[in-house]
């Protein structure tokens, strides 16, 4: 491994179908990829009315939008599914949204961030 | 890398069973997430149902339930899927397939396919 | 379950040409759509996973967009081994499903 590099070994699984597929609801998933690919956890989850819906959770695959990221946050503006990636074992078990606010004019009245769910 | 080997053609009666099997090669077969795709000539993809060994229990569609069954033996490495009566409509060819990852992302490898015929 | 079509069923190209594949679904599998390339006689490939991430060793000219219900592959600058079926699947749900083949024919 790279110093510096959170490799990912496992991911939490989680998948919210879980009795109409027929799989666990929750679990450890062990990541696999090309030697030469980076691993990575992933979270997608819904906001129905202010209440978290994880949809699911797992291994995720070489993305460059993924490296050096320790935490799984989310940071798009109000996504149809929220999703965020991250580096290092088990790293998806918490998430959160943090979405990036656009810069525009600077206004007398700073908009606060929205707070962040956790898992 | 893995691969997945699959068992050789097969041509059965009306009313019978068959069962094929896949074999995998490459890294831990229980952590593996495998389909079973059936294609009929010149038709579309089909999913069957698919299974993870290390859970061992196999999700089938609807359309299959009660009539396919797929196994996995850890010892050997090998995925099998078992089809009973059989109806001239389920001359296909069976791919055995193996997931990206759990949440099935995608269906990344592929078995060479094997020739199921069901003629009387 | 979750049905899935696509448009057109056959279209003609040219090398060098672009041409977009569409897939629509029944309901939202968010963004858990894949393409898949497949030849006579050949086993499928996997092209795109989870809509627009291209699987690791397929060329860039090929890419996917979309999300809810609406998805597209985009092939550009198409070469000879392109021309071959296209379909789509769904993997939000079981019964996870495909869409009944796009046909690329050289024109």
């Known amino acids: 491994a790279i110093l510096g590099r959170s490799e990912t070994q496992e991911c939490l699984f989680f998948n919210a179908n879980w009795e109409k597929d027929r799989t666990n609801q929750t679990g450890v998933e062990p990541c696999y990829g090309d030697k030469d690919k980076r691993r990575h956890c992933f979270a997608t989850w819904k906001n129905i009315s202010g209440s978290i819906e994880i949809v699911k959770q797992g291994c995720w695959l070489d993305d460059i939008n993924c490296y050096d990221r320790t935490d799984c946050v989310e940071k798009k503006d109000s996504p149809e599914v929220y999703f965020c990636c991250c580096e290092g074992n088990m790293c998806n078990e918490k998430f959160s949204y943090f979405p990036e606010m656009e810069v525009t004019q600077p206004t007398s009245n700073p908009v606060t961030p929205k707070p962040p769910y956790y898992n | 890398q893995v691969q997945l080997v699959q068992s050789g053609a097969e041509v059965k009666k009306p009313g019978s069973s068959v069962k094929v099997s896949c074999k995998a090669s490459?890294?831990?077969?229980?952590?593996?997430?495998i389909s079973w795709v059936r294609q009929a000539p010149g038709q579309g993809l089909e999913w069957m149902g698919g299974?993870?060994?290390?859970?061992?229990?196999?999700n089938y569609a609807q359309k299959f339930q009660g009539r396919v069954t797929i196994t996995a033996d850890e010892s050997t490495s090998t995925a099998y899927m078992e089809l009973s009566s059989l109806r001239s409509e389920d001359t296909a060819v069976y791919y055995c397939?193996?997931?990206?990852?759990?949440?099935?992302?995608?269906?990344?490898?592929w078995g060479q396919g094997t020739m199921v015929t069901v003629s009387s | 379950e979750i049905v899935m079509t696509q448009s057109p069923s056959s279209l003609s190209a040219s090398v060098g040409d672009t041409v977009t594949i569409t897939c629509r679904a029944s309901?939202?599998?968010?963004?858990?759509l894949a393409w898949y390339q497949q030849k006579p006689g050949k086993a499928p490939r996997l092209l795109i996973y989870?809509?627009?991430h291209l699987q690791s060793g397929v060329p860039s000219r090929f890419s996917g967009s979309g999300s809810g219900t609406h998805f597209t592959l985009t092939i550009s600058s198409l070469q000879p081994e392109d021309f071959a079926t296209y379909f789509c699947?769904?993997?939000?749900?079981?019964?996870?499903?495909f869409g009944p083949g796009t046909k690329l024919e050289i024109k």
């Open positions: 989870w809509a627009a």
């Open positions: 299974i993870i060994p290390i859970y061992g229990t196999a």
């Open positions: 699947q769904q993997s939000y749900s079981t019964p996870f499903t």
């Open positions: 490459g890294p831990r077969f229980q952590d593996l997430s």
């Open positions: 309901q939202g599998p968010s963004r858990w």
């Open positions: 397939v193996k997931d990206l990852t759990w949440t099935n992302l995608g269906l990344d490898i």
